[in-house]
Amino acid sequence: KAMHVAQPAVVLANSRGTASFVCEYASPGKATEVRVTVLRQADSQVTEVCAATYMMGNELTFLDDSICTGTSSGNQVNLTIQGLRAMDTGLYICKVELMYPPPYYMGIGNGTQIYVIDPEPCPDSD
């Protein structure tokens, strides 16, 4: 059976511009090293938002300047994307790659549509 990656269809970012969703995969092999990449698709353009490689049972580590954080539990990854603005609204796709030991496998989710609404500015208090 092909590696299946599941993620929610829609998520609404909170007022601070933070969105969280779960990326879950059905693994065809017993991987010890997994790479998770979040890709944003908008207007047929695909850009990489963030990526992390982790050892099964260990914490997910993104680069220091990444807008993503995450935790892992078995075949489930809890992803959080921060600093989002209305212009960042789009389809966020979870890609999972089983890197080690061989064989390599790849699975790609259908994407999570993240809606971001910029907060209304506070009215002046004179």
Partner: antibody, heavy 123, light 107 residues
Framework: QVQLVESGGGVVQPGRSLRLSCAAS????????MHWVRQAPGKGLEWVAV????????YYADSVKGRFTISRDDSKNTLYLQMSSLRAEDTAVYYC????????????????WGQGTLVTVSS | DIQMTQSPSSLSASVGDRVTITCRAS??????LNWYQQKPGKAPKLLIY???SLQSGVPSRFSGSGSGTDFTLTISSLQPEDFATYYC?????????FGPGTKVDIK
Amino acid sequence: QVQLVESGGGVVQPGRSLRLSCAASGFTFSSYGMHWVRQAPGKGLEWVAVIWYDGSYKYYADSVKGRFTISRDDSKNTLYLQMSSLRAEDTAVYYCARAPHYAILTGYYEDYWGQGTLVTVSS
Amino acid sequence: DIQMTQSPSSLSASVGDRVTITCRASQSISSYLNWYQQKPGKAPKLLIYAASSLQSGVPSRFSGSGSGTDFTLTISSLQPEDFATYYCQQSYSTPFTFGPGTKVDIK
């Protein structure tokens, strides 16, 4: 334009070693995964090995595992295939091919190929 | 390893014919399938990737379809330059195996 030029092929005796090179130009070499694919005379294509764009991962066909090593030198825009313990069945044209690796929503695919270099293993 | 099979192994066709080549994987590979064309003495050329995406510069008479285990390459109207051997390849899991090829020659 994208160019891949293989070199290093030739006639070699069984059990000996050979190193193939693939010189790349016309694109940002360090942003692409690279593959070696071979084709025995009159036969079909056989995938040999891949190296990730940053050199972090390498994968091999079972038929060459433990005997062949794929590597890259991004400062020279060159891909290598070190072949040891060569056998008659390794006789083939060896192609290098590039594979887009960044922000890919598809499986990997070889979009540009070199013209190949012939390796003949014979006593 | 995932095994790839192709049918037919060879076919004879005329210019203008509609040609269909099938590729089957030994297990589900989702849509991670590529098609290549190779002419004698030449390097392979990418036609289709991800089962149905047409590579830039490839004529629109080539199309691909399928997912899971069964895939098809169709040439809607065969042209003289299309006589060649066609290979499918899976890129779901290493080793990225090729099918044995389908040779298309002139009837």
